[in-house]
């Protein structure tokens, strides 16, 4: 039970990529507004997105304080224009979110191939180390800073003239692969966190091919 004409939020869903984290819910408000609270399992509730008519709330600033913590959020419903009003139980209607552990659950964003360089029959492929919104000592950490060796990249590479994708893996952001002389190759990378059971893989990076401006060829 709650305030007259106020409905509880439902379908509370965490949307998170590279730690940019938004809580979404339904329904679109009719004569009501929402406030969100977030807490760690052992911490105090902190209010965000006060009396909003949105059905989403950016909670990134809170979760980046400790991405290995488990968070819970709740969405309160209030009648529009009468936010002091409470339900029959003496408090506004609210709904809890599922628990969310950013380190284990944030989606891995699409990686980008920064560069590739061929020297003879070797190609060095470098993956861009994407910046996250996680901070340490007032500087933003990269994905590699946050995940360390838990994060690997899988490189798919293939001759432009064929379809079979060879693979290589690295726990840095660089690959050094053997290629056939005189052949052009294409590359795509995927971020992977093998220790996870869900959200293990990112979407693939855009394909980059030799003979395009990103690469450099040196005959040795």
């Amino acid at each position: 039970s709650g305030t007259t004409n106020t409905v509880a939020a439902y379908n509370l869903t965490w949307k998170s990529t590279n730690f940019k984290t938004i809580l979404e819910w339904e329904p679109k408000p009719v004569n009501q507004v929402y406030t969100v609270q977030i807490s760690t399992k052992s911490g105090d509730w902190k209010s965000k997105c006060f009396y909003t008519t949105d059905t989403e709330c950016d909670l990134t600033d809170e979760i980046v304080k400790d991405v290995k913590q488990t968070y819970l959020a709740r969405v309160f419903s209030y009648p529009a224009g009468n936010v002091e009003s409470t339900g029959s139980a003496g408090e506004p209607l609210y709904e809890n979110s599922p628990e969310f552990t950013p380190y284990l659950e944030t989606n891995l964003g699409q990686p980008t191939i920064q560069s590739f360089e061929q020297v003879g029959t070797k190609v060095n492929v470098t993956v861009e180390d994407e910046r996250t919104l996680v901070r340490r000592n007032n500087t933003f950490l990269s994905l590699r800073d946050v995940f360390g060796k838990d994060l690997i990249y899988t490189l798919y590479y293939w001759k432009s003239s064929s379809s079979g994708k060879k693979t290589a893996k690295t726990n840095t952001n660089e690959f050094l692969i053997d290629v056939d002389k005189g052949e052009n190759y294409c590359f795509s990378v995927q971020a992977v966190i093998p220790s996870r059971t869900v959200n293990r893989k990112s979407t693939d990076s855009p394909v980059e091919c030799m003979g395009q401006e990103k690469g450099e060829f040196r005959e040795i």
């Epitope: 798919y156 994708k165 290589a168 893996k169 293990r200 693939d204």
Partner: antibody, heavy 120, light 107 residues
Framework: EVQLVESGGGLVQPGGSLRLSCAAS????????IHWVRQAPGKGLEWVGY????????YYADSVKGRFTISADTSKNTAYLQMNSLRAEDTAVYYC?????????????WGQGTLVTVSS | DIQMTQSPSSLSASVGDRVTITCRAS??????VAWYQQKPGKAPKLLIY???FLYSGVPSRFSGSRSGTDFTLTISSLQPEDFATYYC?????????FGQGTKVEIK
């Protein structure tokens, strides 16, 4: 519990076709990679090919390239090995295996295998 | 493709014996080598990964080591259930390749 179950093996004539299935449970195939490995009677293990069910990327051993096709149906959590233009030398037990996908561990779980016999 | 040359192809040993099987890679494979055990009519089972790490649930009498491109599987004290065929495999490059196998038989 992670499990892989192959099916679809049997007797087929040279030049014929067969489709093997690898039904996975206990994990989501799109989050891993699936390999096929075969073993001719009394012989060693031979890698056939792999698929990344997330993007459909594949690679095949030279011995089967152009004849075999690996695919996956993520809604069924199942991988397939379509074998065409079969030869006597393709007679083997065919295993599917899960690739854990780390630098350290590759094929951590295997199915029980299904026997394919190519004979006239 | 990288060749994995395994030796011996077979050996006879008694319960309690120390058994060593070796595998040589035709080029550098770093530590991307696994060892599998296979019993007749059964699928291979992972024993050792990353050259020297014992896979979960595998008895500690099994161990692996690397020296350059040479890889060794050692069974410190052979048990009756260890009579089987053992395979090495590299997954450093595509395609992954297996050794020819070593059959460990009862003397």
């Amino acid at each position: 519990e992670v499990q892989l179950v192959e099916s679809g093996g049997g007797l087929v004539q040279p030049g014929g076709s067969l489709r093997l299935s690898c039904a996975a449970s206990g994990f989501t195939i799109s989050q891993y990679w699936i390999h096929w490995v075969r073993q001719a009677p009394g012989k060693g293990l031979e890698w056939v090919g792999y698929i990344d069910p997330y993007n459909g990327y594949t690679y095949y051993a030279d011995s089967v390239k152009g004849r075999f096709t690996i695919s996956a149906d993520t809604s069924k959590n199942t991988a397939y090995l379509q074998m065409n233009s079969l030869r006597a030398e393709d007679t083997a037990v065919y295993y599917c295996a899960r690739d854990y996908g780390s630098l350290q561990v590759q094929l951590d779980y295997w199915g029980q295998g299904t026997l394919v016999t190519v004979s006239s | 493709d990288i060749q994995m040359t395994q030796s011996p192809s077979s050996l006879s040993a008694s319960v309690g014996d120390r058994v060593t099987i070796t595998c040589r890679a035709s080029q550098d494979v770093n530590t991307a080598v696994a060892w599998y055990q296979q019993k007749p009519g059964k699928a291979p089972k992972l024993l050792i990964y990353s050259a020297s790490f014992l896979y979960s649930g595998v008895p500690s009498r099994f161990s692996g080591s690397r020296s350059g491109t040479d890889f060794t599987l050692t069974i410190s004290s052979l048990q009756p259930e260890d009579f089987a065929t053992y395979y090495c495999q590299q997954h450093y490059t595509t395609p992954p390749t297996f050794g020819q196998g070593t059959k460990v038989e009862i003397k």
